[in-house]
């Protein structure tokens, strides 16, 4: 059928043009967590730099107590990296002690909260099992997507278990958004 | 106060307008590497196609000598994906033989290099043990993030042990980045 | 040589300017898979949920049948994660046992499918040996990057093994793309 | 658990500013959206607008627009309302509400009548 | 502003009797809230996102629906479900309700 080719290519204007260089975008890095109360079933969200080092946020986008705020509604491309560290969890060990076999595990979570719905939801996870045979182990989980966005919308990245979260290097655990 | 709410997204257009066509990008792909000298303390860096199959540079975006040359100011994505393979790393064998329980472990870092540093700088790094139980292992790992780049600045991708990467096909590793 | 040296940054308009929110862009999200025939040595290729929870697609961008249909050529950015789990690959015993010592992989790679090329082209492959020690393990692969695709172009994910793919959450295996 | 208790003044004068306060506990409220909502007598709700704790960033009701003021004071976990200019029209019990970050919970309301 | 329009006004119906309350906006949206309102109480929510049970809502209560036209289900009414239910529209500019539906026990 002829309605299922593509429209032509050479109209494109439908929406008003703007400037790249004025986008809502952000790059956040991470700090040494401090514990802070959560519910019992919500992971705990992480804090992070805004300002400092590779840290920044332009165009409207702004970072406060643990989530960056949408200026502005569209698409937007949201990533996040955390490194985890831990000492090892001995799944054989475990098993053999008569544990139950379900492994450790380690999760991020990149949230949304928007006032338009009552529960907070998961955008992207990331999660895998840990069983390490060696003593100290270290690994990275990253998580890119993009989304549509409300103006007035809020992102957080929530982890299984901050004490496992490498703090120590900016370029190791981030979190960041760009409007496309 | 009212001022608090979202300035009206109307107000649009604080920059020149930009054709998305013209603006850098690249994707560079793995080559096999020829060992290089590098610094006793300092991650050695792979060199990479940029012109046949998958690998293009356009729009001044240049490679050269290992580097990705940013041709002008302005934030940018980078990302990068690396494929490690390698003979086991035997951690509990290695814990019974009385060596030091550190397990081995396999590093990316993107790295900028700029003319107002003294220091290049770690944008980007992954960093994951490696303990295996099975002979031979191989595993990918992958970054991405913004950054804020300045006409000059160069791009390069480090790793902890180039013999341990797979540039068998372009697919599996890779490096680019692009203008927002 | 002078010819060498930057363009002025300037001259920056040599393409139709083109409204962002017109841009073709998908996300896709996981939805349970029904068995399908597939070549006997091409990994299968997973199918996709485009409008309900936080899939979309927009902008002429069309999913059909496994694939996303590229409506306009350009540079996009393309991206995919895939959960992998599965009951433990148990390589020492494996070995014991005399079995090849080849571990067990799991391998995501995003395809495009071109009619100007007979076979299918891998942009790009996560593979990663699976060697538990644990019983129940699960893992993400990730992959994103850019490439010139042509209008007409079909993109999909295959993987090696459907039955290990996580179908339970929409956040943990997705897949998309969009013009830059 | 979670729990919202608005307070204020039960009668305002013709022409004055209603003022009242939203005070939460039970969760951090930052992690929500706190939103205003009226029902005048023998009528329906009105949603009069909404503030984001953690940024202060606030969304109106066009039709109060000109009259309504909310804020946020999160050393002590409040939210504040402020109506200017009442007339006998907005005599109404008055519900703050929270959404986003948890279950939607709304406060048990508060009576304002405007009268001299 | 979108204006949402609810129907019935009130009705009167027996214990395990089926209810339906329909809703209808002035234009599209993505998604309809409805709540419950006892007399002197607080509105609670019911159904969240169309067709979302609320933490805690027996599951007589349902929601379905798209676009302009949605509608609320109790499947068994029950004593304790005597009140006024209200949709509401979160995505326009104000938020608006629906002018309620008082439910009342023959």
């Known amino acids: 059928l002829k309605g299922q080719e593509f429209a032509p290519s050479h109209q494109q204007v439908y929406a008003p043009l703007r400037a790249d260089g004025d986008k809502p975008r952000a790059h956040l890095t991470v700090v040494r967590q401090t514990p802070t109360q959560h519910f019992k079933n919500q992971f705990p969200a992480l804090h992070w730099e805004h300002e400092l080092g590779l840290a920044f946020t332009k165009n409207r986008m702004n970072y406060t107590n643990k989530f960056l705020l949408i200026p502005e509604s569209g698409d937007y491309f949201i990533y996040s990296q955390v490194t985890f560290r831990g000492m090892t969890s001995e799944c054989s060990e475990i098993r053999q002690a008569g544990r139950p076999n379900k492994p450790d595990s380690i999760t991020v979570v990149i949230t949304k909260v928007t006032d338009s719905y009552p529960e907070p939801t998961q955008l992207l996870m990331g999660t895998k099992s840990v069983c390490e045979v060696g003593s100290n182990w270290f690994q990275p989980i990253y998580l890119g997507a993009m989304f549509s966005l409300q103006e007035g919308d809020k992102l957080m990245v929530n982890v299984s278990d901050i004490s496992l979260v490498d703090y120590t290097k900016e370029d190791k655990t981030f979190f960041g958004a760009f409007l496309l | 106060l009212k001022g608090q709410e979202f300035a009206p997204s109307h107000q649009q257009v604080y920059a020149p307008l930009r054709a998305d066509g013209d603006k850098p990008r690249a994707h560079l792909t793995v080559v096999r590497q020829t060992p290089t000298q590098h610094f006793k303390n300092q991650f050695p860096a792979l060199h990479w196609e940029h012109e046949l199959g998958l690998a293009f540079t356009k729009n001044r975006m240049n490679y050269t000598n290992k580097f990705l040359l940013i041709p002008e100011s302005g934030d940018y994505f980078i990302y990068s994906q690396v494929t490690f393979r390698g003979m086991t790393s035997e951690c509990s064998e290695i814990r019974q033989a009385g060596r030091p329980n550190k397990p081995d472990s396999i590093t990316v870092v993107i790295t900028k290099v700029t003319d107002s540093y003294p220091e290049p700088t770690q944008l980007l790094m992954g960093t994951k043990s490696v303990c295996e139980v099975g002979s031979n292992w191989f595993q990918p790992i992958y970054l991405g993030a913004m950054f804020s780049l300045q006409e000059g600045d160069k791009l390069m991708v480090n790793v902890s042990d180039i013999s341990l990467v797979d540039y068998t096909k372009e697919d599996k590793t890779f490096f680019g980045a692009f203008l927002l | 040589l002078k010819g060498q040296e930057f363009a002025p940054s300037h001259q920056q308009v040599y393409a139709p300017l083109r409204a962002d929110g017109d841009k073709p862009r998908a996300h896709l999200t996981v939805v349970r898979q029904t068995p399908t025939q597939h070549f006997k040595n091409q990994f299968p290729a997973l199918h996709w949920e485009h409008e309900l929870g936080l899939a979309f697609t927009k902008n002429r961008m069309n999913y059909t049948n496994k694939f996303l249909l590229i409506p306009e050529s350009g540079d996009y950015f393309i991206y995919s994660q895939v959960t992998f789990r599965g009951m433990t690959s148990e390589c020492s015993e494996i070995r014991q046992a005399g079995r090849p010592n080849k571990p067990d992989s799991i391998t995501v790679v995003i395809t495009k499918v071109t009619d100007s090329y007979p076979e299918p082209t891998q942009l790009l492959m996560g593979t990663k040996s699976v060697c538990e020690v644990g019983s129940n393990w699960f893992q993400p692969i990730y992959l994103g990057a850019m490439f010139s695709l042509q209008e007409g172009d079909k993109l999909m994910v295959n993987v090696s093994d459907i039955s290990l793919v996580d179908y339970t959450k929409e956040d943990k295996t997705f897949f998309g793309a969009f013009l830059l | 658990q979670v729990q919202l208790q608005e307070s204020g003044p039960g009668l305002v004068r013709p022409s004055q500013t209603l003022s009242l306060t939203c005070t939460v506990s039970?969760?951090?409220?930052?992690?929500?959206?706190m939103h205003w909502v009226r029902q005048r007598p023998g009528r329906g709700l009105e949603w009069m607008g909404r503030i984001d704790p953690a940024s202060g960033h606030t969304k109106y009701n066009p039709s109060l627009k000109s009259r309504v003021t909310i804020t946020r004071d999160t050393s002590k976990n409040q939210v504040s309302l402020r109506l200017s200019s009442v007339t006998a029209a907005d005599t109404a019990v008055y519900y703050c509400a929270v959404s986003g970050g948890m279950p939607d919970v709304w406060g048990q309301g508060s009576l304002v009548t405007v009268s001299s | 502003d979108i204006q949402m329009t609810q129907s019935p006004s009130s009705l009167s119906a027996s214990v395990g009797d089926r209810v339906t309350i329909t809703c209808r906006a002035s234009?599209?949206?993505?998604?309809m809230y409805w709540y419950q309102q006892k007399p002197g109480k607080a509105p609670k929510l019911l159904i969240y996102a169309t067709s979302n049970l609320a933490s805690g809502v027996p599951s007589r209560f349902s929601g379905s629906g798209s676009g302009t036209d949605f509608t609320f289900t109790i499947s068994s009414l029950q004593p304790e479900d005597i009140a006024t239910y209200y949709c509401q529209q979160w995505e326009g500019n104000p938020r608006t309700f629906g002018q309620g539906t008082k439910v009342e026990i023959k």
């Open positions: 234009q599209g949206v993505e998604y």
């Open positions: 039970g969760f951090d409220y930052q992690d929500t959206y």
